[in-house]
């Protein structure tokens, strides 16, 4: 008949199992459990996989593993503590004294429960690579945090080539023994050894358990160096930026740390693992049975098969390794997991241009002289698309990208972010929000949802805020519906008149010019340059202004910068910026300083778009390690990543407003990264490019 | 040089439909939108409709929507009004006319002259 | 539908003399005018849009005017071979609609 095959990963571990597999056969349990030797968890997750066993308990790490590289599924959970159930949190903790905040981490002094534990280790470092708060350079993840923290104690890193930073705040036992061991040797390991460092001074943050501050303060029956702490003297640090009550861990904390699970192959009948193990657990988890599933006493060891604190098993419903860790265990697995030895040799950089290719090589000299890892190889292409085309078929790795592009490589493409550019706060050309501007008018008021039949001002056919978005956003909407594709037709049957300036027009509906004015001579109406005086941002606004049109579709800033007398030009030098206002998508209208809140879209930065099975991580790492030697455009190390200039070019590899590369963060995907506005307005442009 | 070459005079009774072509030449035929537009001596020059060679999206005045019916064959660079249910009132010159940079007739063929009679 | 209205079915001149052909819309076109000519027996041929723009190769004798709902076409000196129909057209909105015609005859 069927038999189930448990996988032991030790010698005690097999002894257990035997004995598990004795009683259960007494006991008449079915099918039957037989045990299989592995040598490791690895090991064991390989031998279901291959179909030589079945079953194995997992932790949140392994089963991540085994899940994402195997098609293991978690089908049982342990529970340990009523209250939290099959779980528990990882928390920051740090005194109320302080200052520190999740984003203020870098410098200070950190404290560990050791080195890979869960919530000492894994979680916190983890979660900080995966926010972007930490990079970290070809996995080397002990050096990037022996570089992030100002000192750490993390028992067990003795033995890495960082143990001066990471044991620097370590002290052993009360004779100076055992620093930095991964044992009760050194005082400052473990959960309450982690927090001890931090009550003692001796470091600003410790990474624990939800229940470590309140186990080991308030005169709970403690050693001495606890006895006069009081709960209310900490706090926990919360992913937001803010901080929280040690009594807020389920609203504030890094993660919640799944239990450990069974985990099986796809094709395994869950329930029948379940009711096997059910059946056993009535019968042998309490004391006096013959046998103890929950304890390895008896084996001189800790944790065999099942955690020992493990109050009952339960039936997973939902059947998946991601549902089972919960999504920000999960994150924080991404950010921790790089193996080096399968980490690529080299990151293949897409280059579009003779001056982009002259960049890239240097660029990659420059990097190779400075040991960075991955090593940039430059491969060129005939296009942004034929770029994706190439990193989709894994021929090139990675390649900066403008919005439309992005969106482009996401939806057709399946690339994703890997990190960004950031510019400079003031610099409003190069990320941007797109408005609707119209005249302050209590008489004749109407709102986006009115705009048909109104005259528009837009700064150019194609211009992203002056066509792209608004036009896509209406038609995402389902103001403007046009009809066999024509765009042009729909807008020009939608507003009364309209100018939008063009370059080479074919077909072009004359009334999309109908409010272009041409140049002083009457000529060049509706040219798409500045013999148009309605052309561009400022010639929108000025279309408006005038009394041309009622609504201007233009960037943020342009009504800042041609009123109040920043524009000293006769038809701009008396405008205030308060006769003006923002059409908002809720139908109301704003203050024109109100754009963050009230705008069609947010026009996004460039991103530096990969394959979804590249580790984003190592790519930011990269960058993030490039950028501290030659991102500053006055930098003396024979490289400038920012700078076109020598190359008689412009926004080579990167664009040149850039000041810094930025992570990810939380938007992985290419929605997340142009935001809901912006898609929106692109789905409705390309829902009808037929 | 724009050329558009159209279909001979057409001789038909009322009731029947007739089909006129127009063969367009000396540019790229997909790039540019073909109008038809109706001449005769009651109402001077009347628009009928307009399509695109691309992909043979039409646009029609209201009062020829019943009437005519605007075709194109890529493949010979060719555009086609089909009349339908003609009457005495639908004898006049057919001229087929490309759009320029705008959308309206700039380049006209030379017409077809179309005579419905019992 | 808007409306071209060109009041003069008819006007004569003599060669070398300034003759102006108006147009009237039924509403404002934004100048989103446009003229023709037609010869006897021909088709007819732009002559002007964006009511004062000339197409290629039209000579500069021909010039357009006009905003809102008036629209003008001034011959500054008639030649013989201007001898033709001339009519307005509105291309704001479809269905494009055109004027009855103005016959130019030479005295």
């Known amino acids: 008949g069927m038999e189930v095959r448990w996988c032991a990963t030790s010698d005690p571990e097999q002894h257990k199992c035997g004995n598990m597999s004795e009683a259960f056969r007494e006991a008449g349990i079915q099918p039957s459990l037989l045990c299989v030797r592995g040598t490791s968890a690895d090991h064991c997750v390989q031998l279901i996989a291959a179909q030589e066993a079945d079953a194995i308990t997992l932790d949140g790490g392994a089963i991540y593993e085994a899940g994402k590289e195997h098609g293991l599924k978690p089908v049982v959970g342990e529970v340990y503590d009523q209250e939290v159930g099959t779980s528990y949190y990882a928390v920051a903790v740090v005194r109320r004294s302080s200052h520190v905040t999740i984003d203020t981490l870098k410098g200070v002094k950190s404290c560990h429960t050791g080195i890979n534990r869960t919530v000492g280790w894994n979680v916190p470092v983890g979660y900080l690579v995966e926010s972007g708060r930490l990079s970290v350079m070809g996995c080397d993840v002990l050096k990037a945090v022996s570089d992030y923290f100002g000192g750490s104690c993390v028992p067990g890193a003795g033995e890495t080539s960082y143990s001066e930073s990471l044991c620097r705040l370590c002290r052993g036992d009360s004779s100076g023994e055992g620093v930095c061991d991964k044992s009760p040797l050194e005082r400052y390991y473990d959960y309450s050894g982690a927090f001890r460092c931090l009550a003692e001074g001796a470091g600003d943050v410790a990474f624990v358990k939800h229940s470590t501050v309140l186990e080991n303060t308030d005169g709970k029956t403690l050693p001495s160096w606890g006895q006069a702490l009081l709960s209310q003297d900490f706090e926990l640090l919360c992913r937001d930026g803010s901080r929280a009550d040690v009594t807020e861990w389920r609203q504030c904390h890094l993660a919640r740390v799944p239990a450990h699970a069974v985990v099986v192959r796809a094709d395994t009948d869950g329930g029948l693992i379940f009711r096997l193990l059910n059946e056993g657990q009535r019968l042998f988890s309490h004391e006096g049975s013959s046998f103890q599933m929950f304890s390895s006493e008896a084996y001189g060891q800790k944790d065999l098969l099942f955690k020992d604190s493990t109050s009952e098993l339960v039936p997973i419903a939902t059947q998946t390794y991601e549902a089972w860790l919960g999504h920000e265990y999960l994150h924080a697995m991404k950010g921790l997991l790089c193996d080096p030895n399968r980490l690529p040799p080299y990151l293949r950089w897409c280059v579009l241009s003779t001056p982009e290719i002259q960049k890239c090589g240097d660029m990659a000299v420059a990097f190779r002289r400075q040991r960075l890892k991955p090593e940039i190889q430059c491969v060129s292409a005939k296009s942004p698309q034929h770029c994706m085309e190439r990193i989709q078929a894994e021929q090139v790795d990675a390649v900066t990208l403008s919005g439309e592009d992005i969106y482009t490589a996401g939806k057709t493409y399946g690339l994703v972010p890997a990190a960004g550019e950031h510019y400079a706060p003031e610099d409003s050309s190069n990320s941007y929000y797109v408005v609707a501007v119209v005249r302050r008018d209590s008489s004749h008021a109407f709102t986006l949802d009115e705009l048909r039949g109104k005259r528009s001002c837009h700064a150019g056919f194609g211009s992203p805020a002056g066509w792209d978005v608004p036009v896509g956003a209406l038609i995402q909407r389902g103001f403007i519906r046009p009809k066999d594709c024509d765009v042009l037709t729909a807008v020009s049957e939608f507003f009364n008149a309209s100018c939008v300036p063009v370059n080479n027009p074919k077909n072009y509906p004359s009334s999309l010019c109908a409010l272009c004015v041409g140049d002083e001579q009457g000529r060049n109406k509706c040219v798409g340059n500045s013999q148009e005086r309605y052309y561009g941002y400022r010639g929108a606004f000025r279309c408006l202004v005038e009394n041309a049109g009622d609504v201007a579709f233009v960037r943020h800033t342009t009504v800042f910068d041609n009123t109040n007398g920043h524009n000293s030009e006769p038809w701009a030098a008396e405008l205030r910026s308060e006769d003006y206002e923002l059409l908002c998508p809720n139908g109301a209208r704003a203050e024109v300083s109100q754009f963050a809140a009230c705008n069609l879209a947010q026009i996004p930065p460039h991103a530096v778009m990969v394959r979804p099975d590249t580790n984003i991580f190592t790519v930011y790492g990269l960058l993030d390690k490039a950028q501290d030697l030659f991102g500053d455009d006055h930098n003396k190390n024979g490289f400038k990543m920012f700078d076109s200039s020598n190359y008689h070019g412009q926004d080579l590899l990167f664009k040149d407003a850039t000041v810094r590369a930025v992570p990810v963060g939380e938007k992985t995907t290419y929605r997340g990264w142009l935001g809901l506005d912006y898609v929106a307005a692109l789905e409705g442009m390309s829902s009808q490019q037929c | 040089e724009v050329q558009l070459q159209q279909s001979g005079p057409e001789l038909v009774k009322p009731g029947a439909s007739v089909k006129i072509s127009c063969k367009a030449s000396?540019?790229?035929?997909?790039?540019?939108?073909l109008h038809w537009v109706k001449q005769s001596h009651v109402k001077s020059l009347e628009w009928i409709g307009r399509i695109n060679p691309y992909n043979g999206a039409t646009s029609y005045n209201q009062i020829f929507k019943d009437k005519a019916s605007l075709t194109v064959d890529k493949s010979s660079s060719t555009a086609y009004m089909d009349l339908h249910s003609l009457t005495s009132e639908d004898s006049a010159v057919y001229y087929c006319a490309r759009g320029g940079d705008y959308d309206f007739p700039w380049y006209w063929g030379q017409g077809t002259t179309l005579t419905v009679s019992p | 539908d808007i409306v071209m209205t060109q009041s003069h079915k008819f006007m004569s001149t003599s060669v070398g003399d300034r003759v102006s052909i108006t147009c009237k819309a039924s509403q404002d076109v934004y100048a989103a005018v446009a003229w023709y000519h037609q010869k006897p027996g021909q088709s007819p041929k732009l002559l002007i849009y964006?009511?004062?723009t000339r197409h290629a190769g039209v000579p500069d004798r021909f010039t357009g005017s006009g905003s809102g709902t008036d629209y003008t076409l001034t011959i500054s000196s008639v030649q013989a071979e201007d001898l033709a129909l001339y009519y307005c057209?509105?291309?704001?909105?479809?269905?494009?609609?055109f004027g009855g015609g103005t016959k130019l005859e030479i005295k």
């Open positions: 057209q509105q291309h704001y909105r479809t269905p494009w609609t």
């Open positions: 964006w009511a004062s």
């Open positions: 000396g540019y790229s035929f997909t790039d540019y939108y």
